[in-house]
């Protein structure tokens, strides 16, 4: 039998071709030139190889490549990726945007692996920050992406990248991250006229305070109440019943559903009887008539 | 979590050819590739063929003169299709993919019965 | 005539341990190729239950186990119990019909 560690007479790959799905694990090992693979990378997705056949070429590469492949080979790697670990992605300088989308189309209909993350991170870093045609990529393949990062990550986005944010992308986003996003979309959004901005604006809302909720009750926007829901509880509260009649318009008939919910909850508990009386809905749970509402945070605030 | 729904003719004639589609659901037909997989009632599994992301096809060296396989993407949907059938062809009919990065075949379509018989 | 052999049947009382055999040539599991174990229930589509020769998918209890050598392999089962009666198969890759080849399948009855 022939040693396992030589290429039978005969056998040595000329050229990366269909002939070596034929080889046997070792023979691949064997017969195949790192050197001959790494210019060759193109075809390897044009010739039908296991993925266990896969692992074989990927070890070909490490050996030519310790230190981590280079660009050109890495644009080529197809499904190869797939057997990349998070460690051999870290010794990687990805910079082009299009060698990032070959990748993550490799991955798609699957979840985020900790590979993938990992190459967005490298691939981030690299750039410096998060930009809109960066954002527009990964947001079209990971919807999710934008709320998996970090409110300090976040904080690199910058606003002009915002407008590639779709609704769906910021669903799994908390409060934290979106008190980051809003007033970069805030910012982004600003030359928009009323109707237009609130489209655009509604989805960070979740990260708006007070006071631009007061400013949005003046413009007849019809906020849902799915939006209202997730609105932070500390900016709903200061509201009174006429400013969030005006924010809601005729969808305030939905705060009766959500009376046992935050922020609604807690809103009418801050709210007097008399005034919620007027929506007629049936709210209860308001101040009693004749009683005295002492804002006791004011009062720290002041002393 | 990916789902594969097998549909097609449970009867067909002696010398006909036997078409059977393989649904994609919760997840993209870009997988590396995916495969046909049959057995024979009270016997064992075959592979029948595979079909690669980019159209690729490689088949059972025992078939390959009667198996097509193809894919459209825009259906989530790949199929078969094995001319001049006979009785030796009866079999439940599995669609297959692997696991992420592994030759193994983690998901599985629950299967179709297809008899050849006039 | 499968490609790869094993057993057509074998048997344990429950809380025994059983062997399942598969063995393959110079082409499959010779050649290096990892072995993959499917559990077949009656009317049902297999299930995978050992990829790359001993790794468990999540779900799939520590009572399996695979181990390789040379040509061939086999699926160990611990604490037997009625559950786990069904069909076994392995498979691997064959270099010479660059496809994949399966065992004939073994039937695992419980007593």
């Known amino acids: 039998e022939v040693e396992k560690t030589a290429c039978p007479s005969g056998k040595k790959a000329r050229e990366i071709d269909e002939s070596l799905i034929f080889y046997k694990k070792w023979e691949l090992e064997a017969c195949v030139d790192a050197a001959l693979l790494a210019t060759q990378m193109d075809r390897v997705n044009a010739i039908p190889f296991t993925y266990e056949q896969l692992d074989v070429l990927k070890h070909k590469l490490d050996e030519l490549y310790p230190q981590g492949y280079p660009e050109s080979v890495i644009q080529h790697l197809g499904y190869l990726f797939l057997k990349m670990s998070p460690e051999d992605i870290r010794k990687w300088n990805v910079t082009s945007l299009e060698t990032l989308k070959a990748l993550l189309e490799v991955n798609k209909g699957h979840e985020m692996s900790p590979q993938v993350a990992t190459l967005i991170d490298r691939f981030v870093k690299g750039r410096g920050q998060l930009d809109k045609d960066t954002l527009d990529t990964l947001t079209a393949f990971y919807p999710g992406y934008l709320c998996s990062l970090s409110p300090e990550e976040l904080s690199s986005v910058p606003p002009s990248s915002i407008w590639a944010v779709r609704p769906q992308d910021l669903d799994t986003c908390d409060p934290r991250q979106l008190d980051v996003l809003y007033p970069k979309a805030r910012l982004a959004f600003q030359n928009m006229n009323g109707s237009e901005y609130f489209v655009k604006i509604q989805s960070f809302l979740g990260g708006a305070p007070t006071e631009d909720l007061k400013a949005l009750s003046q413009q007849n926007v019809s906020m849902d109440l799915a939006t209202f829901m997730k609105l932070r509880t500390d900016a709903v509260l200061p509201l009174t019943v006429a400013e969030v009649q005006k924010l809601l318009g005729p969808h305030v008939e939905g705060l009766k559903a959500e009376e046992r919910h935050r922020p609604v909850r807690d809103w009418i508990l801050r709210q007097r009887q008399d005034d919620l009386d007027t929506l007629g809905l049936g709210l209860q749970g308001g101040i009693p008539n004749g009683y005295l509402v002492l804002d006791l945070s004011m009062q720290e605030a002041l002393s | 979590q990916v789902q594969l729904q097998e549909s097609g003719p449970g009867l067909v004639k002696p010398s006909e050819t036997l078409s059977l589609t393989c649904t994609v659901s919760?997840?993209?037909?870009?997988?590396?590739?995916w495969n046909w997989i049959r057995q024979p009632p009270g016997k064992g599994l075959e592979w029948i063929g595979r079909?690669?992301?980019?159209?690729?096809?490689y088949y059972n060296p025992s078939l390959k003169s009667r198996v097509t396989i193809s894919g459209d993407t825009s259906k989530n949907q790949f199929s078969l299709k094995l001319s001049s059938v006979t009785a030796a062809d009866t079999a439940v009919y599995y669609c297959?993919?692997?696991?992420?990065?592994?030759?193994?075949?983690?998901?599985w379509g629950q299967g179709t019965m297809v008899t050849v018989s006039s | 005539q499968s490609v790869l052999t094993q057993p057509p049947s074998v048997s344990g009382a429950p809380g025994q341990r059983v062997t399942i055999s598969c063995t393959g040539s110079s082409s499959n599991i010779g050649a290096g190729y990892d072995v993959h174990w499917y559990q077949q229930l009656p009317g049902t589509a297999p299930k995978l239950l050992i990829y790359?020769?001993?790794n468990r998918p999540s779900g799939v209890p520590d009572r399996f186990s695979g181990s390789k050598s040379g040509t061939s392999a086999s699926l160990a089962i611990t604490g037997l119990q009625a559950e786990d009666e069904a069909d076994y198969y392995c498979?691997?890759?064959?270099?010479?019909?660059?496809?994949?080849?399966f065992g004939g399948g073994t039937k695992l009855t419980v007593l």
């Open positions: 919760g997840g993209s037909i870009s997988s590396y590739y």
């Open positions: 079909i690669y992301y980019n159209g690729n096809t």
């Open positions: 498979q691997s890759y064959d270099s010479s019909l660059s496809g994949w080849v």
């Open positions: 297959a993919r692997p696991k992420l990065g592994i030759d193994a075949f983690d998901i």
């Open positions: 790359g020769n001993s």
